[in-house]
């Protein structure tokens, strides 16, 4: 290929901009941020402003489809080669909103001139040692930086898996200094819990630097290593609520007191770990779902402590499940439901079987944590109730792969026990024939963690209906 | 198996091919459906001026030629070979050239081809002489260059720590070690042949002479795992690091009253991430390797390491899937009786 793909992509973009200029009268005449005379090292930031702008077809005439396709192509991510990203990234580039706003015609002209400038830069950088002796690019910037956080345990994940490169992560608050973590790692995740728990109400920003594996001192052509910024993250507002657990229930006459375990977090105060309630206070509420073991009709109650006191009918056994909620949030408001706990469980033998299956799964999860099993397993992550038996059989089959690959006696025994429990409960339903369900091999392959999470979800479906 | 042609990186998504080589998105002609003058020729050029970077790394190039009473069209696109296109499976997706095959479509003549070298759907070949069973290696864009899929990357080098230049026994400059360094943490590692440290902090040891150390302790209350850098000239926990030159961290029990205490040290990067308890691990003979692994029907394997305790995976060939409940894993293990290493038999079945 005479020209590299970065050039092809940039040239394509110029062609698309030119094509859109022909349809400028069919675009919504909205004023859009249009960077001009972009300062050096802020070209990629300006480029992303052009890509993010809400350029829209005015939905008139026959050109709507071609316009929409062109706009879609404009918004496709360019190849993030070092030639593109190996500029001195700065945190001080202007925000998109601060650029002058222009109607579509000028917007497109300015976009084109930025693209031309970037092509020129790219060509000149190729003659300035941006490639190593074998002709391959040194490093690629990290991308898809994602915060994964539950009950404040916070991990930054990114892509790609490194090929001849290593990463270092930095984190800071908006006003604070950068702190380096996970030095020169080949992992694509970094546990930043220690940093964010210092003040969970602060907003944090992280960045991932890429270095050539053979020489971490070597940097991009502008004298700094490539890096990519994460989205901002405010733990108090964004950490996911972990699955709650029912600690106990106690019946006195026609009242039952249900207590939710106060989950410990990794947030410290005066050298002690705070519970979820300590951190969130009255911002955290729990919703209790409860129903008679003999029926499916659910009732619900709420509390802003960790205790519920509910009325029940005498002589009836009830099942309980709780969900944590933070009403003041607009997203990530709810946790997943807790495992179901039932009164007098000997009466609901199959429900108890399923509850035991969940505890076996938790045991397997704990046991494999310290093993390196990289298998991917067929996983039904969105089980339709009419296919739950078929899906369960796939989960049980694939569980045997974990048993095989761990070579661990206690995992083997736990898996064997779990399969017996599950098969007992499945056979209690008689031979259910489900039609139109996916074969195991048609399912997506997921890593073990996701497989086990989905397994727990399907077991909960059985608990809720057994 | 030749490594998949490597292209410069599109960071949208990184996928690896059967050999574990990074598979970058394909460059294909992408003009969708256009009228064409291509007729009664052994081969045609697409006359499509748009080269597109396929959105997903697994996508290949496709060309569809159709002729009816009114006109001839040529369609050029990227498409995922796992999914049918125009109701047909892309059987030839791995081919480097786009060799047209006729498909049955009522009311029209319909040819389709797919291929996986850059812009390979620019030149579409109808000629029956073209030997599809043995396509030549040319055409498309050459893979060229070093670092093809199967080559084992060189050991990670580290930058010089200028505080102190140290050389090894051969006079070569010795760079500081990379080790897991989480100090003491609670652990779930128990009764296992080997464990991962679950320490996410990789540290560059302060001094070039330092090695990686792991300490596993169990008492009535809990289990801990300690990971650090340490200078082997100095004792650690009152014990000399006798195994500091070992590339792997092989645990040895030490006498400590009131607890079970294991310690190991090693001098390859992050070697204290994987701690090995298994006595079968033959420390006296670290050079034992496995022969090439056995073949499994409808599957390939690309071995990254033949050394003892390597774990490798077979991958089902295109059009086949791993049968649920079967494992693609094979492990290089030692037969104690013969002291010969062999690969374990995977339970893998590949089905259509």
């Amino acid at each position: 290929q005479g020209q590299d793909r970065h050039m092809i992509r940039m040239r394509q973009l110029i062609d698309i901009v030119d094509q859109l200029k022909n349809y400028v009268n069919d675009l919504v005449p909205e004023f859009l941020p249009a960077p001009e005379d972009v300062e050096t090292n802020c070209e990629w930031s300006a480029f992303s402003c052009f890509q993010k702008a809400q350029l829209k077809s005015a939905n008139t005439g026959n050109n709507e489809r071609i316009i929409n396709v062109s706009i879609k192509k404009l918004k496709r991510k360019p190849p993030s080669t070092n030639a593109g990203r190996r500029q001195k990234h700065r945190l001080t580039c202007p925000s998109c909103d601060s650029y002058e706003k222009k109607p579509p015609k000028e917007f497109l002209e300015r976009f084109k001139s930025l693209l031309q400038k970037m092509i020129h830069q790219h060509l000149s950088s190729r003659t300035h040692g941006s490639e190593d002796s074998s002709g391959t690019t040194n490093t690629v910037a990290a991308y898809n930086l994602t915060w994964k956080s539950t009950n404040f345990k916070t991990i930054l994940e990114w892509e790609p898996k490194p090929v001849n490169q290593v990463y270092t992560v930095q984190i800071s608050t908006k006003s604070g200094d950068w702190k380096s973590k996970c030095f020169y790692t080949t992992d694509t995740e970094c546990d930043l819990t220690d940093e964010i728990v210092k003040d969970v109400k602060q907003t944090y920003l992280a960045r991932v630097f890429s270095y050539p594996a053979g020489n971490v001192e070597s940097t991009g052509s502008a004298g700094e290593p490539l890096y990519e910024n994460s989205p901002e993250f405010t733990p108090y507002l964004e950490t996911n609520l972990g699955q709650p657990t029912i600690q106990s229930f106690e019946q006195v006459g026609t009242k039952v007191n249900v207590t939710v375990e106060d989950e410990r977090t990794l947030v410290r105060r005066n050298n002690t770990f705070l519970s979820l309630r300590d951190v969130f206070g009255k911002d955290l509420i729990y919703t209790l779902y409860y129903w008679k073991s003999s029926s499916s009709g659910k009732k619900t109650a709420k509390t802003n402590t960790n205790e519920f006191l509910i009325d029940v009918d005498k002589g009836e056994n009830y099942c309980f499940s709780v969900q944590a909620v933070i009403p003041s949030r607009t997203v990530n408001r709810k946790s997943t439901d807790s495992p179901v706990e039932c009164m007098g469980q000997e009466k609901g033998e199959f429900r108890e079987n399923w509850v035991n299956v969940i505890s076996d799964l938790k045991k397997i999860e704990d046991l494999i944590q310290s093993m390196h099993i990289d298998a991917t397993l067929y996983t039904e992550s969105d089980v339709h109730p009419s296919c739950k038996v078929t899906a369960m059989k796939c989960f049980l089959l694939e569980l045997q792969v974990i048993s095989l690959e761990s070579g661990d006696a206690s995992i083997h025994d736990t898996v064997e026990n779990l399969i017996i429990l599950a098969n007992n409960s499945l056979s209690s339903n008689g031979n259910v024939t489900e039609s139109g369900c996916k074969e195991c091999e048609e399912l997506e392959e997921k890593n073990i963690k996701e497989f086990l999470q989905s397994f727990v979800h399907i077991v909960q479906m059985f608990i809720n209906t057994s | 198996i030749p490594p998949h042609v490597q292209k410069s990186v599109n960071n949208d998504m990184i996928v690896t091919d059967n050999n574990g080589a990074v598979k970058f998105p394909q460059l294909c002609k992408f003009c969708d459906v256009r009228f064409s003058t291509c007729d009664n020729q052994k081969s045609c050029m697409s006359n499509c001026s748009i080269t597109s970077i396929c959105e997903k790394p697994q996508e290949v190039c496709v060309a569809v030629w159709r002729k009816n009473d009114e006109n001839i069209t040529l369609e050029t696109v990227c498409h995922d070979p796992k999914l049918p296109y125009h109701d047909f499976i892309l059987e030839d997706a791995a081919s480097p050239k786009c060799i047209m095959k006729e498909k049955k479509k009522p009311g029209e003549t319909f040819f389709m081809c797919s291929c996986s070298s850059d812009e390979c759907n620019d030149n579409i070949i109808f000629s029956e002489e073209y030997n599809t069973s043995n396509p030549d290696g040319g055409g498309g864009s050459g893979g060229g260059g070093s670092g093809g899929g199967g080559s084992i990357p060189p050991h990670v080098q580290k930058s010089v720590n200028n505080d102190m230049i140290v050389t090894d026994n051969n006079g070569a400059v010795k760079f500081p070690q990379l080790c897991k360094f989480c100090d003491v943490r609670f652990s779930t590692c128990d009764n296992q042949k080997s464990c991962m440290s679950n320490c996410s902090i990789t540290s560059i040891c302060e001094k070039p002479q330092e090695v990686c150390v792991a300490v596993w302790r169990k008492n009535d209350e809990n289990i801990t795992l300690e990971t650090v850098c340490h200078d082997p000239k100095l004792p650690y926990h009152d014990f000399i690091l006798e195994d500091a030159a070992s590339p792997k961290c092989i645990m040895k029990e030490k006498k400590k009253p009131g607890e079970t205490f294991f310690m190991c040290s090693c001098s390859s990067d992050e070697c204290n991430d994987n701690i090995i308890f298994s006595e079968e691990y033959n420390t006296s003979n670290p050079d034992i390797t496995c022969p090439p692994p056995m073949s499994v029907e409808h599957a390939d394997i690309w071995v990254k390491s033949y050394s003892l305790y390597s774990r490798e995976r077979y991958i089902c060939n295109s059009g086949f899937k791993r049968k649920a409940g079967t494992s693609s894993l094979t492990e290089c293990v030692l037969n104690k009786a013969t002291n010969v290493a062999h690969w374990t038999t995977p339970s893998l079945k590949c089905i259509r």
Partner: antibody, heavy 117, light 107 residues
């Protein structure tokens, strides 16, 4: 901005069924329960039940069990209420509303269902 | 089930008056109570949540108080647009019952 838009009024014969829809926009649909409330002519508000789009759990008032069935389509952020075996006393305005756990902060415009032979 | 008894059922007042409506729960509901206003032919509108908190965009002349079983809702100085029907609702446990409503009319 946050909106709940309900389907138009319906006139049904006794014994028939009706499905009322409530399309949500401007917020994360699965993060909030959807409540259904009935108001008979000249009367007060009666709680029918709610559905949690996150986990599919439904809670009904005893008086509406077997009468109302609540469902959601997450892909279109739409909640549905089906009323079966309609009788003249089911003639009412039916509201959907968003539950913020401590109250119902946004309401649909209401759907009038008339049951008449 | 928890019964909510609202009083009075109707009330006549003049612009500028201070009016109070009460709501009594048949068992303790902590502060899980909301107040709504409804005008004829319109949907209800949230005024107060968690017994005492003013909803977004609601004028400060509206206030709520109480916890446990006894709750009250006050309009400190009636405005012409305040003449409507007011409802309390407990959101503590299902079924989430409403009071029967208080119709506020112009004297």
């Amino acid at each position: 901005q946050i909106q709940l838009v309900q389907s138009g009024g319906e006139v049904k014969k006794p014994g028939a069924s009706v499905r009322v829809s409530c399309k949500a926009s401007g917020y994360s649909f699965t993060d909030y329960n959807v409540y259904w409330v009935r108001q008979s002519p000249g009367k007060g508000l009666e709680w029918i039940g709610y559905i949690d789009p996150y986990n599919g759990i439904t809670i009904y008032d005893q008086n509406f069990k077997g009468k109302a069935t609540l469902t959601v389509d997450k892909s279109t952020s739409t909640a549905y209420m089906e009323l079966s075996s309609l009788r003249s006393e089911d003639t009412a305005v039916y509201f959907c509303a968003r539950d913020v756990t401590t109250a119902l902060d946004f309401w649909g415009q209401g759907t009038t269902v008339t049951v008449s032979s | 089930d928890i019964q909510m008894t609202q009083s009075p059922a109707s009330l006549s007042a003049s612009v500028g008056d201070r009016v109070t409506i009460t709501c009594l729960a048949s068992q303790t509901i902590d502060t899980w109570l909301a107040w709504y206003l409804q005008k004829p032919g319109k949907s209800p509108q949230l005024l107060i949540y968690a017994a005492t908190n003013l909803a977004d965009g609601v004028p400060s002349r509206f206030s709520g108080s109480g916890s446990g079983t006894d709750f009250s809702f006050t309009i400190s100085s009636l405005q012409p647009e305040d003449f409507a029907t007011y409802y309390c609702q407990q959101v503590y446990s299902s079924p989430f019952t409403f009071g029967q409503g208080t119709k506020l009319e112009i004297k």
